[in-house]
Each structure stands twice: as structure tokens, then as C-alpha cells.
């Protein structure tokens, strides 16, 4: 029986440019994790395996980072970040637990400024 | 439990349309992804496309795209494929899965039971 | 797009037997393959996801193996019932793709 839950950071933000941790954190069973996938709707990020280490998208390769721990740090973020993640656990022998994050990049302080400046 | 049952064979001529549909049971419809999967007489299995019945989004295979369209009626938990300008090329068996978690991998988990649709004047 | 190629189209194998399916990848996937079941006239039914992990329900004598572009899938003692066509598919990226499929026949 699965016992476990999934927390996540839940819904966050972050700015245009900056980077942004995506975190997950798995309570409630003695299931061993043996592998954690960090996907979008319709394409994997990256996994992390208990024997492989860790598999970047080279889609992904210049943006992300392995880490910390079963997370992942997502870089020079864009607008076009904007969305769902999801954390996919694989345990043993629970089977699998998923998460979702949801993460808005917004415009920078600057450039939010400096879209309400109006000339007179 | 988790069902999707398909509409019946379709006997369609070319040039002409068909709408397939998928009735989901068992779980809530919106919370799940719904994939169609084509397969022609004695061959292997091709990826249309899926559908967030929830949102309305949709992402389509490039092959598939003005061939296919993807859309879901959630008051009924059905989700439909309507399939255009068809051709004996389209003859084919047409299904719809389901993922097996909620913000799963798409590893296809649960399927409907294929809907034959054959092109023919 | 990736494409799973599937090197045999028909094995042949003895009940008790062991038998293993290969599926090579034209990119690096990880471990992001299913395999899949179909016997004849009925749909799909998924064995093994992320290479190794066996679905719910799915007999022990299942497993999966592989990664980067190499992958597996074996029965280690050949039931009758296995009588079917085993397809592995990509779960990395869009579209998702799958192997023209292997028929496994009972001698």
C-alpha cells in the first residue's frame, strides 16, 4: 500500500534572468527511492537514478543543474518557463509518486518599472 | 475502476470526416491526460497526439497535425478525435490511453479498446 | 524525432524458456522506455516504464533493463500466454515514439 506524500514548493515565482530551485520531498514511507524524474507535460528535464547519477535533456543542458540534493536548478530563466513541473519518484517497493510545481517567471523589478513610466 | 470506452466502427468514404470518441469512467476525467494512439492492419503503433481534457490543451505528432483534432467535453467525460479529408491511409484501428499518474510520465497505463476505421468508397 | 528501432520482427521461443527483446534508442532517452503487450485483437497493455520498473499487477517473470540507447526486455520462463507482440516507446520527449514491435511465437 502507498503511504507516502509528495511535498513541493507548490506555486512560485521567480524573475526573468534569475534562477529558481524546484524541489520535492517525499514523507510518510520507508520506500526506497531509487529514481526521480524532473519532467513538463511533454518533454523530460532530467532524472536522477540511484546507480546512473544524473541525466541532464540536452535540450536543458545549458539551464539546468543537477541539485541540491534530488532537486533541480533551473537558470537564465525566460518567460517562456512559465508552467507545470513535475517530480516523478520511482520507489521500492511503493511504486511511483508525483508532484507538481507550478513556477510564473515574471519581468524583472526594472523592466516592471519601467513599463509604467509614461511620457507626459 | 479506470475505463475508456470507444465509439464503434466507422465505415467512412474519402475526403469525408469521422469523430471518435472516448468515455472515461472511473477516475476524474479532468485531472488525467488523454493520449490517441494509431494503428494500421498489422502494424505498429504511431503517437497522434494528447489533450488536457481539464485546460483544452493539446499537443499534437507533426505528421498528424491538420489531419487530426483533439478535444474533450468535460460534462460528459468524453474526450474526441475527429480525423479529416480522410484517405485509405487513415484506415486504421484508432485508440485513446490514459497516463497512469495524475502528473505522470507518459507511459501509456490504461486503454481504450480501438475504434477500426476504414476508408473506403 | 527519436526512433526506437526493434532488430526483430519475430522470435520464436519454447515454453519455459528465457527470451529477451532488444530496443535501441537513435538518441541517449536515460531510462525513459515502456514496453508494452498486445496480443492479437486486443489493446496495449503496459509491462515496464522507465526501463526497469514493472506496472501494477505485472508477473515477476517481467523485467526491463537499459539505458542511454540500449534496452532490454526479457521473460525469464515463457508462459503460453505470452503469445502476443511486445513494442517498446520512448517516454523522453515529443512525440513520443515507439519500436515496430517484436512477435514473440511459441514453438
Known amino acids: 500500500m502507498m503511504t507516502g506524500t509528495i511535498e513541493t514548493t507548490g506555486n512560485i515565482s521567480a524573475e526573468k534572468g534569475g534562477s529558481i530551485i524546484l524541489q520535492c520531498h517525499l514523507s510518510s514511507t520507508t520506500a526506497q527511492v531509487t529514481q526521480v524524474n524532473w519532467e513538463q507535460q511533454d518533454q523530460l528535464l532530467a532524472i536522477c537514478n540511484a546507480d546512473l547519477g544524473w541525466h541532464i535533456s540536452p535540450s536543458f543542458k545549458d539551464r539546468v543543474a543537477p541539485g541540491p540534493g534530488l532537486g533541480l536548478t533551473l537558470q537564465s530563466l525566460t518567460v517562456n518557463d512559465t508552467g507545470e513541473y513535475f517530480c516523478i519518484y520511482h520507489t521500492y517497493p511503493d511504486g511511483t509518486y508525483t508532484g507538481r510545481i507550478f513556477l510564473e517567471v515574471l519581468e524583472s523589478s526594472v523592466a516592471e518599472h519601467g513599463a509604467r513610466f509614461q511620457i507626459p | 475502476q479506470v475505463q475508456l470506452q470507444q465509439s464503434g466502427a466507422e465505415l467512412v468514404r474519402p475526403g469525408t470526416s469521422v469523430k471518435v470518441s472516448c468515455k472515461a469512467s472511473?477516475?476524474?476525467?479532468?485531472?488525467?491526460?488523454i493520449e490517441w494512439v494509431k494503428q494500421r492492419p498489422g502494424q505498429g503503433l504511431e503517437w497522434i497526439g494528447v489533450?488536457?481534457?481539464?485546460?483544452?490543451?493539446?499537443n499534437y505528432n507533426e505528421k498528424f497535425k491538420g489531419k487530426a483534432t483533439l478535444t474533450a467535453d468535460k460534462s460528459s467525460s468524453t474526450a474526441y478525435m475527429q480525423l479529416s479529408s480522410l484517405t485509405s491511409d487513415d484506415s486504421a484501428v484508432y485508440f485513446c490511453?490514459?497516463?497512469?499518474?495524475?502528473?505522470?510520465?507518459?507511459?501509456?497505463?490504461?486503454w481504450g479498446q480501438g475504434t477500426l476505421v476504414t476508408v473506403s468508397a | 524525432d527519436i526512433v526506437m528501432t526493434q532488430s526483430h520482427k519475430f522470435m520464436s521461443t519454447s515454453v519455459g524458456d528465457r527470451v529477451s527483446i532488444t530496443c535501441k534508442a537513435s538518441q541517449d532517452v536515460s531510462t525513459a522506455v515502456a514496453w508494452y503487450q498486445q496480443k492479437p485483437g486486443q489493446s496495449p497493455k503496459l509491462l515496464i516504464y522507465?526501463?526497469?520498473y514493472r506496472y501494477t499487477g505485472v508477473p515477476d517473470r517481467f523485467t526491463g533493463s537499459g539505458s542511454g540507447t540500449d534496452f532490454t526486455f526479457t521473460i525469464s520462463s515463457v508462459q503460453a500466454e505470452d503469445l502476443a507482440v511486445y513494442y517498446c516507446q520512448q517516454h523522453y520527449s515529443s512525440p513520443r515514439t515507439f519500436g515496430g514491435g517484436t512477435k514473440l511465437e511459441i514453438k
Open positions: 472511473g477516475y476524474a476525467f479532468t485531472n488525467y491526460l
Open positions: 522507465s526501463a526497469s
Open positions: 489533450i488536457n481534457p481539464g485546460s483544452g490543451g493539446n
Open positions: 490511453a490514459r497516463r497512469g499518474d495524475k502528473y505522470g510520465s507518459a507511459w501509456f497505463a490504461y
